[in-house]
């Protein structure tokens, strides 16, 4: 004959454990039902009555089968530098992740505790390692033959255009200026040019008609008295 199915609460056989979704109540010394996700134990079981479960209140949750007396509080609302990627429900906590242009500088079990803006590389520097959800951008000086004239968390160093006749040689922060109407060729616009490992040498020293006209890192950028538009910190 098949063994009879025991209904909770029941006393377990010596040496055995309670079944799945049951827990052993030390006071009652019985196997009792757990509450499902989204619920909590309102009344604990006795020798004669099973656990009484109740739904979690607003802004509280339980994610697992449980016998906790109170549901867990959902985390605080996401800050302005975060987006809510998972809402607070009776069965799950709110999850906040960093909004685009930011990365997680201090993570927690789920989501992010502290977001920080991605580093922006200034002219003469390009993105050598892009930012991710959990790591900042790494900027590197543009190698000879490449330049970046922007302050950006995404722009890489791009190759100088090749001129028939050079009017102004390029440098780390400025493209070459050609005297002819069009360059003989320009590298593919999508080509990635990260700094190359080279032996120690002086940066940006290219043959130029007049070295004094091509300083090591010069810029052609618009002037203006207004603060930079990248954010309140200018960074």
């Amino acid at each position: 004959l098949p063994a009879q199915v025991a209904f909770t609460p029941y006393a377990p056989e010596p040496g055995s454990t309670c079944r799945l979704r049951e827990y052993y109540d030390q006071t009652a010394q019985m196997c009792c039902s757990k509450c499902s996700p989204g619920q909590h134990a309102k009344v604990f079981c006795t020798k004669t009555s099973d656990t009484v479960c109740d739904s979690c209140e607003d802004s509280t949750y339980t994610q697992l089968w449980n016998w906790v007396p109170e549901c867990l509080s959902c985390g605080s609302r996401c800050s302005s530098d975060q987006v809510e990627t998972q809402a607070c429900t009776r069965e799950q906590n709110r999850i906040c992740t960093c909004r685009p242009g930011w990365y997680c500088a201090l993570s927690k079990q789920e989501g992010c505790r502290l977001c920080a803006p991605l580093r922006k590389c200034r002219p003469g520097f390009g993105v050598a390692r892009p930012g991710t959800e959990t790591s900042d951008v790494v900027c590197k000086p543009c190698a000879p033959g490449t330049f970046s004239n922007t302050t950006s968390s995404t722009d890489i160093c791009r190759p100088h255009q090749i001129c028939n006749v050079v009017a102004i040689p390029g440098n780390a922060s400025m493209d070459a200026v050609c005297t002819s109407t069009s360059p003989t060729r320009s590298m593919a616009p999508g080509a990635v040019h990260l700094p190359q490992p080279v032996s120690t040498r002086s940066q940006h020293t290219q043959p130029t008609p007049e070295p004094s006209t091509a300083p090591s890192t010069s810029f052609l950028l618009p002037m203006g008295p207004s603060p930079p538009a990248e954010g309140s910190t200018g960074d």
Epitope: Q196, Q203, P227, P228, G234
Partner: antibody, heavy 119, light 106 residues
């Protein structure tokens, strides 16, 4: 916390060379370039050059191009600045400073190394 | 090379005074100008970068501004710990420090 710790004071004869070290801690050494800046007694600050520890790329001020060599050893997170053919007017405090290539420039400095050139 | 002309070279002031130090670039340097504070026997300390941006931990009495190629560091109300030497630094076209301004107690 971020720290740049430099080697101790040096006394050198004219014509000799000096090598100053700058040990970095508290951040990823290869993610920042290291600048070297000097300051003669009672004078202003003078930029000498930078090194990218990752690749060894350098950029030197014209004034120092023929006499300075900047290197780095990533295994010990240390940058070095060697100045050769020393003259009495090279007597100065030499500083290292880090730079991440963002608009936030030279946000951490070493304590400085006094180099005295005297016969 | 771009030259940075800093003025005045020295300045006497009292606690509570409003003080301005000016740096003029010989060419356009966009907003790539920083201000450093240096006390005797110490390394320089970054106060302001990108012309306007206050470095973390620097008191809000320090501020930076710009008009064309003229850049200004303002200390709104001098505190005893502010007496030091201040340097501007351009990092747009190469790298160049201004000559410095020694701020002394009147």
């Amino acid at each position: 916390q971020v720290q740049l710790v430099q080697s101790g004071a040096e006394v050198k004869k004219p014509g000799a060379s000096v090598k100053v070290s700058c040990k970095a801690s508290g951040y990823t050494f290869t993610d920042y370039i290291i600048h070297w800046v000097r300051q003669a007694p009672g004078q202003g600050l003078e930029w000498m050059g930078w090194i990218d520890p990752d690749y060894g790329n350098t950029d030197y001020a014209d004034k120092f191009k023929k006499r300075v060599t900047m290197t780095a050893d990533t295994s010990i997170s240390t940058a070095f600045m060697e100045l050769s053919r020393l003259r009495s007017d090279d007597t100065a405090v030499y500083y290292c400073a880090r730079d991440d290539g963002s608009p936030l420039v030279m946000d951490a400095w070493g304590q400085g190394t006094l180099v005295t050139v005297s016969s | 090379d771009i030259q940075m002309t800093q003025s005045p070279s020295s300045l006497s002031a009292s606690v509570g005074d409003r003080v301005t130090i000016t740096c003029q670039g010989s060419q356009n340097i966009d907003n790539y100008l920083a201000w450093f504070q240096q006390k005797p026997g110490k390394a320089p300390k970054l106060l302001i970068y990108s012309t306007y941006s206050l470095q973390t931990g620097v008191p809000s009495r320090f501020s930076g501004s710009r008009s064309g190629t003229d850049f200004t560091l303002t200390i709104s109300s001098l505190q005893p710990e502010d007496f030091a030497t201040y340097f501007c630094f351009q990092y747009n076209n190469g790298y160049m420090f201004g000559g410095g301004t020694k701020l002394e107690l009147k």
